[in-house]
């Protein structure tokens, strides 16, 4: 495997992770793919300190994070445990609201204008944040 020791150009280093903040919007799945092609993942918020860091960089703009419940329970994209982990939902969220008229509920989490989290329709074109950890050996699949 290879090890990343410094952040790519235009990524921001913070607490041994690299972050990339988009300036345009994508559906959640497209944002997830974008991060994965860069050997990263949608941001996983594990502490109040990280929450404040991300919030400072994104400003008051709806922004996707790496949290969804498209397969049932809420899950972080990197496998971080949701139940025991950091949460910052808005009051009465997540609510899986069906009243938007777009079909289905709300399965993807985003930062709202005040930084707190909301669940929303995954197809909405929100900005997003990619994150990758420094000094973490990336696993290369065996060649067949």
């Amino acid at each position: 495997g290879s090890e990343r020791t410094c952040c790519p150009v235009n990524w921001v280093e913070h607490e041994r992770s690299c972050y990339w903040f988009s300036r345009s919007g994508k559906a959640w799945a497209d944002a997830d793919n974008y991060c994965r092609l860069e050997d990263a993942h949608l941001v996983v918020v594990t502490s109040w300190e990280e929450q404040k860091f991300v919030q400072h960089h994104i400003g008051p703009v709806n922004t996707w994070m790496g949290l969804h419940d498209q397969n049932g329970p809420w899950k972080w994209v990197d496998g971080t445990d949701y139940e025991t982990g950091f949460k910052n939902w808005r009051p009465e969220q997540p609510d899986d609201w069906y009243g938007h008229g777009l079909g289905g509920g709300e399965d993807c989490a985003h930062f709202t204008d005040d930084g707190r989290w909301n669940d929303d329709v995954c197809q909405r074109p929100y900005r997003w944040v990619c994150e990758t950890e420094l000094d973490k050996a990336s696993q290369e699949p065996p060649l067949l």
């Epitope: 290879s2 300036r23 919007g25 497209d30 092609l37 860069e38 050997d39 696993q139 290369e140």
Partner: antibody, heavy 123, light 107 residues
């Protein structure tokens, strides 16, 4: 100077297999995602597959999903495309391409391409 | 999948002419669009990325514009080496689809 050199093309029967290689030089190979793009004779360009720099994440066009496998060996600076269950419609020149992105918007693009290798699927 | 269309399909022009090619996406792709030039028997060559950024080494007579769904590639004064086929490509979402191409030939 960035160079990409494809090899492994040739004539294969329908249902057969082939493995294409793309030898890269002139840049830090493991730092860049790579793609395969193909072009049927007299036709336009079709994106086939992409792989992240580490090789940990792969992406495919629906037309090849389940039949083609993209991989890379960063110790050898080489990209691969394993093609199984080949069909006549897979006949094309296959190009490997290096992906970069606009540092402001993040918009990806293919800045360097190999010369291509021809795959012909015919009985 | 995002469908890309180009117009015209082909254009006959003379050296010195201004040529404009249009590319349209079936849904908004921000400015996540690239333009490539391809000559017969050769690999594509990147001209424009992020809709309007000129790739290093590409002559300034090439320019790109647009955002959302409608984009254009312009060649301000066609040169003999510009006769080729031009493709647009969206990289907003997988699959990274190309337009069908526009062939620019000699009038």
């Amino acid at each position: 100077e960035v160079q990409l050199l494809e090899s492994g093309g040739g004539l294969v029967q329908p249902g057969g297999s082939l493995r294409l290689s793309c030898a890269a030089s002139g840049f830090t190979f493991s730092s860049y995602a790579m793609s395969w793009v193909r072009q049927a004779p007299g036709k336009g360009l079709e994106w086939v597959s992409a792989i992240s720099g580490s090789g940990g994440n792969t992406f495919y066009a629906d037309s090849v999903k389940g039949r083609f496998t993209i991989s890379r060996d960063n110790s050898k600076n080489t990209l691969y495309l394993q093609m199984n269950s080949l069909r006549a419609e897979d006949t094309a020149v296959y190009y490997c391409a290096k992906k970069d992105y606009d540092y402001v918007w993040g918009s990806p693009y293919f800045d360097y391409w190999g010369q291509g290798t021809l795959v012909t699927v015919s009985s | 999948d995002i469908q890309m269309t180009q117009s015209p399909g082909s254009v006959s022009a003379s050296v010195g002419d201004r040529v404009t090619i249009t590319c349209r996406a079936s849904q908004g792709i921000n400015n996540w669009l690239a333009w490539y030039q391809q000559k017969p028997g050769k690999a594509p060559k990147l001209l424009i990325y992020a809709a309007s950024s000129l790739q290093g080494g590409v002559p300034s007579r090439f320019s790109g514009s647009g955002s959302g769904t409608d984009f254009t590639l312009s060649i301000s004064s066609l040169q003999p080496e510009d006769f080729a086929t031009y493709y647009c490509q969206q990289t907003d979402s997988f699959p990274f689809t190309f337009g069908p191409g526009t062939k620019v030939d000699i009038k």
